[in-house]
């Protein structure tokens, strides 16, 4: 049994880091493998992650972490029974993938304005709370070419757009994702999408 693709990990910079790797053949990850991880720090204890299958030869493990900060560095040991298959390290702050925003809502009751709001996925005491920026994707269910991205570079988790910038009388969907420049993160996953019917009064023409 050998590791074909070494584990690569990303952290949500809050409580979970996800590591993925591939073995050289079909593997029952949860019964055959264990990923041990330990913070390089005074008094830290070793923890064991039981991986799940991710395709025939792929494995994924969700590492639980408390109080993630930039100084943290973890040692990783991948074991198959008594055999050490791979040894490495992981610094969560250097591989951050933020959590996806939630609770995306479209408010259509403001005259001729669409207000989209969502929730910041981090608590106020997490460093990323005040450092997320967002991308909002809006698309038409009827017209695949009617697809747009709005970059939200301010901190407030909301976006206002004129209803008239979208076509009237058809349904639209929206979703939002986040990233943080300070840690050069990857984009988060998209939030679940939300749907609304866009209707507004055309301005009266003389």
């Amino acid at each position: 049994m050998k590791v074909l693709q070494e584990p690569t990990c990303v952290s949500d910079y809050m409580s979970i880091s996800t590591c993925e790797w591939k073995m050289n053949g079909p593997t029952n990850c949860s019964t055959e493998l264990r990923l041990l991880y330990q913070l390089v720090f005074l008094l830290s204890e070793a923890h064991t992650c039981i991986p799940e299958n991710n395709g025939g030869a792929g494995c994924v493990c969700h590492l639980l972490m408390d109080d993630v900060v930039s100084a943290d560095n973890y040692t990783l040991d991948l074991w198959a029974g008594q055999q050490l298959l791979w040894k490495g390290s992981f610094k969560p702050s250097e591989h951050v993938k933020p959590r996806a925003p939630g609770n995306l809502t479209v408010h259509t009751n403001v005259s001729d304005t669409l207000l989209l709001t969502w929730s910041n996925p981090y608590p106020p005491d997490n460093y990323l709370y005040n450092h997320l920026t967002y991308a909002v994707n809006i698309w038409s269910e009827n017209d695949p070419a009617d697809f747009r991205i709005y970059n939200v570079t301010y901190l407030e988790p909301s976006l206002r757009i004129a209803a008239s910038t979208l076509k009237s009388g058809i349904s639209y969907r929206a979703r939002v994702r986040a990233w943080a420049q300070c840690y050069n993160t990857t984009w988060s996953e998209w939030s679940p999408s939300t749907k609304w019917h866009n209707s507004y009064r055309e301005p009266f023409e003389q």
Partner: antibody, heavy 116, light 111 residues
Framework: QVQLVQSGAEVKKPGASVKVSCKAS????????MHWARQAPGQGLEWMGI????????SYAQKFQGRVTMTRDTSTSTVYMELSSLRSEDTAVYYC?????????WGKGTLVTVSS | QSVLTQPPSVSAAPGQKVTISCSGG????????VSWYQQLPGTAPKLLIY???KRPSGIPDRFSGSKSGTSATLAITGLQTGDEADYYC????????????FGTGTKLTVL
């Protein structure tokens, strides 16, 4: 919000022991390390040791090895610091502080006076 | 005796900028992260800066931190009378054993 409430001031004689408590609230007690530091009158801060409330393991500054004991009670979210064989130079304000690589939150401090 | 050296005192007028230095070595500041603490008279220390340059929520952006090599600097702009306090740097010694270190402390006087 996070609160670290320490026990009240103590006056001790040389050779005696003192036990200072620090009750934590407002966060997951076992998810954060707790440090102890002290500050003699008019002096700077001095680190004494650290306890992991999850398992109770400890590490002490070399200067205090053999004289200090840190414990915790997870049922009351309280950590304790006991210093024995007190001498006059142990007169100081003793602080508990939550954190790992740095100290996020501090207790208000407990003044321990050692005097004959 | 701390191995992190700070100036004993600094002073400046309200509205001015002041910097406080913290000098260490390769086994501490040079190989670790720096934090800064403010201790107002008669109170417990309070975290001002961590991770060399990050501010906890609630700390105004008048306070900033930086690190270069084996030394670190705390800068305070737009000085206010309420900033008069003792300031301590902190880091970790990584050799021979891991222990936290505090600087010698600097008394800031707002003239």
């Amino acid at each position: 919000q996070v609160q670290l409430v320490q026990s009240g001031a103590e006056v001790k004689k040389p050779g005696a022991s003192v036990k200072v408590s620090c009750k934590a609230s407002g966060y997951a007690f076992t998810s954060y390390y707790m440090h102890w530091a002290r500050q003699a009158p008019g002096q700077g801060l001095e680190w004494m040791g650290i306890i992991n409330p999850s398992g109770g393991s400890t590490s002490y500054a070399q200067k205090f090895q053999g004289r200090v004991t840190m414990t915790r009670d997870t049922s009351t979210s309280t950590v304790y610091m006991e210093l024995s064989s007190l001498r006059s130079e142990d007169t100081a304000v003793y602080y508990c502080a939550r954190g790992k690589w740095w100290f996020y939150d501090w207790g208000k401090g407990t003044l321990v006076t050692v005097s004959s | 005796q701390s191995v992190l050296t700070q100036p004993p005192s600094v002073s400046a007028a309200p509205g001015q900028k002041v910097t406080i230095s913290c000098s260490g070595g390769s086994s501490n500041i040079g190989n670790s992260y720096v934090s800064w603490y403010q201790q107002l008279p008669g109170t417990a220390p309070k975290l001002l800066i961590y991770d060399n340059n990050k501010r906890p929520s609630g700390i105004p952006d008048r306070f900033s931190g930086s690190k270069s090599g084996t030394s670190a600097t705390l800068a305070i702009t737009g000085l206010q009378t309420g900033d008069e306090a003792d300031y301590y740097c902190g880091t970790w010694d990584t050799s021979p054993s891991m222990i936290p270190l505090f600087g010698t402390g600097t008394k800031l006087t707002v003239l």
